[in-house]
Interface confidence: low
């Protein structure tokens, strides 16, 4: 099927932060369609052509001392500068997860089932979700979705446990997250009608 | 190569394309959109309320986009008019929270691997177009230099309604519909041995 012709140019000014601002790296990328053609890497200190298409630009920009000096200063003037702003805002953002458990099928004792622990609406991304059966951690039969980015500054993740419920069994989904003073634990009891948060 | 770091920011992502022609200017932090500049209205639109305390001069974005336009024209000539290759987008639909009938929720349609960044995302309810309660992100950048975009539909889940996220893109032979309907939790019954 014929589609319109399109030509795309991208420029990405990227800052990489490790251990606060102890290690900061600026990489500015010029991209034609999806091909990166020129890069300025603060670890290198000058423009480098990534492909032949970017050679004239790299040579020209390196010849312009004002452009080069501005780029060399950008790791401080852009990256570190903006990181101070992030420290006041995004890096302090904490949204507590909501945790619920649901079985994937109608429960029946001694019948194979899947318990789904839905951990939703949290920020930042790092999270630890574990399953326990009668206070013993379950590692076999645990399947997790990747971390899901909602695109609205929240994340979610679903962690499934394959199980065969026995009468009296207590299954616990245990969630640790930077927004929480102490972990969230939600219980699901074989024969009970609902999951309960402790 | 992907650079390993605790945090990655894009200050900013500048995009200009001949189709339209159109441009986009955003800042991203750890993969989320901080703001975009509405290039037509010449205003900065913040995507996270806490960031509204700060200022970003939209003129900076407009100047950058003008430079990109100039650079693109040079590259089209230099590349003997090598146009963008259409990629096949991947579409996933899921809810923001676990579904309870009658409880407000949000459907999320993730359109991944978008290139070039021209796409039409719409929502259907029982086959009919829905326009109310619909919003979407800007084109969000990826390390392979393709994009993704997320569309949202606020809804009140009911057993009678099913939904489709409809995606139109040049990489698709025909519009792609991803279906979603509420999974009504299995009724709780007395357990029998």
């Amino acid at each position: 099927r014929d589609s319109p012709e399109d030509f795309v140019y991208q420029f990405k000014g990227m800052c990489y932060f490790t251990n606060g601002t102890e290690r900061v790296r600026l990489v500015s990328r010029s991209i034609y369609n999806r091909e990166e053609i020129v890069r300025f890497d603060s670890d290198v200190g000058e423009f480098r052509a990534v492909t032949l298409l970017g050679l004239p630009a790299a040579e020209y920009w390196n010849s312009q001392k004002d452009i080069l000096e501005r780029k060399r200063a950008a790791v401080d003037r852009v990256c570190r500068h903006n990181y101070q702003l992030e420290l006041r805002t995004t890096l302090q953002r904490r949204v507590e997860p909501t945790v619920t458990i649901s079985p994937s099928r109608t429960e029946a004792l001694n019948h194979h089932n899947l318990l789904v622990c839905s951990v939703t609406d949290f920020y930042p991304a790092q999270i630890k979700v574990r399953w326990f059966r009668n206070d013993q951690e379950e590692t076999a039969g645990v399947v997790s979705t990747p971390l899901i980015r909602n695109g609205d500054w929240t994340f979610q993740i679903l962690v499934m446990l394959e199980m065969t419920p026995q009468r009296g069994d207590v299954y616990t989904c245990h969630v640790e997250h930077p927004s929480l003073q102490s972990p969230i634990t939600v219980e699901w009891r074989a024969q009970s009608e609902s999951a309960q948060s402790k | 190569e992907d650079i390993v770091a605790d945090h990655v920011a894009s200050y900013g992502v500048n995009l200009y394309q001949s189709y339209g022609p159109s441009g986009q200017y955003t800042h991203e932090f750890d993969g989320d959109e901080q703001f975009y500049v509405d290039l037509g209205r010449k205003e900065t639109v913040w995507c996270l309320p806490v960031l509204r305390q700060f200022r970003f001069d939209p003129q900076f974005a407009l100047t950058n986009i003008a430079v990109l336009k100039h650079n693109l024209n040079s590259l089209i000539k230099r590349s003997n008019s090598t146009a963008a290759t259409n990629e096949v987008p991947e579409v996933t639909v899921f809810s923001k929270s676990p579904v309870t009938l009658g409880q407000p929720n949000i459907l999320i349609c993730l359109v991944d691997n978008i290139f070039p960044p021209v796409v039409n995302i719409t929502w259907l309810s029982n086959g009919h177009s829905v326009t109310e309660g619909v919003s979407e992100t800007s084109f969000l950048s990826k390390s392979d230099h393709s994009f993704f975009k997320i569309s949202y539909l606020t809804l009140l889940p009911s057993a009678e309604e099913s939904y489709d996220c409809k995606v139109e893109h040049w990489g698709l032979d025909k519009p792609l519909l991803k279906h979603w309907e509420p999974e009504i939790p299995a009724p709780m019954s007395e357990l029998t041995e």
């Epitope: 003037r77 570190r80 500068h81 101070q84 702003l85 420290l87 | 509204r52 305390q53 700060f54 200022r55």
Partner: antibody, heavy 121, light 112 residues
């Protein structure tokens, strides 16, 4: 755009006092950080407190000022500084200052003329 | 808290000469430094921000440099009107909602 401080006075040790900063030519509907800085006679500048005038109303103090000084936004054009348990060491000219907006780093780019507080028995 | 150490505490310069004032932060503040000029009976006036950017309306004979912990204010072609006390001011965010906004002790500049 200007700032003016008021409320400076001669007070006895142990007393409380409230200073007011009034903005002219702009209002806090555009959010700013508003601050108080003081200067003892013949001495240097000392930051006391700041408040973000947006909806969060976040306040910031150096460790020495916490508890005894309270900054508040009282209207769309006024910010106050409440001071308690005053001592002779608090004798100073108190400046109201607006922070330069829109930068990752913050500086004071608009100052009031100052108001004198004297603590003496 | 961050300490800003300013040197010298006073300096005398001839008209047309150059004055250099140094400011040292007790830990890195990157480019988070400003310089102010204060004349007797007046509030301070912002001269330089982000370590080296000139505030609007400030003559180009004033310049700032440095980053991290060491900063310098230079006044070249000193004029009589430059007689004043100059302060450096560091801005650092210490995490968990704590800011360190600290001034140096000041440098009094006299013109001969």
């Amino acid at each position: 755009q200007s700032l003016e401080e008021s409320g400076g006075d001669l007070v006895k040790p142990g007393a409380s006092l409230t200073l007011t900063c009034t903005a002219s030519g702009f209002s806090f509907s555009s959010s700013y950080y508003m601050c108080w800085v003081r200067q003892a006679p013949g001495k240097g500048l000392e930051w006391i407190a700041c408040i973000y005038t947006g909806s969060s109303g976040s306040t910031y103090y150096p460790s020495w000022a916490k508890g005894r000084f309270t900054i508040s936004k009282t209207s769309s054009t006024t910010v106050t500084l409440q001071m308690t348990s005053l001592t002779a060491a608090d004798t100073a000219t108190y400046f109201c200052a607006r922070v330069r907006a829109g930068s990752g780093y913050y500086y004071f780019n608009l100052w009031g003329p100052g108001t004198l507080v004297t603590v003496s028995s | 808290d961050i300490v800003m150490t300013q040197t010298p505490s006073s300096v005398s310069a001839a008209v047309g000469g150059t004055v250099t004032i140094k400011c040292q932060a007790s830990q890195t503040i990157y480019s988070g430094l400003a310089w102010y000029q204060q004349k007797p009976g007046q509030p301070p006036k912002l001269l330089i921000y982000d370590a080296s950017d000139l505030a609007s309306g400030v003559p180009s004979r004033f310049s700032g440099s440095g980053s991290g912990t060491e900063f310098t204010l230079a006044i070249s072609g000193v004029q009589c009107d430059d007689a004043a006390t100059y302060y450096c001011h560091g801005d650092y965010y210490g995490g968990s909602g704590t800011f360190f906004w600290t001034f140096g002790g000041g440098t009094k500049v006299e013109i001969k």
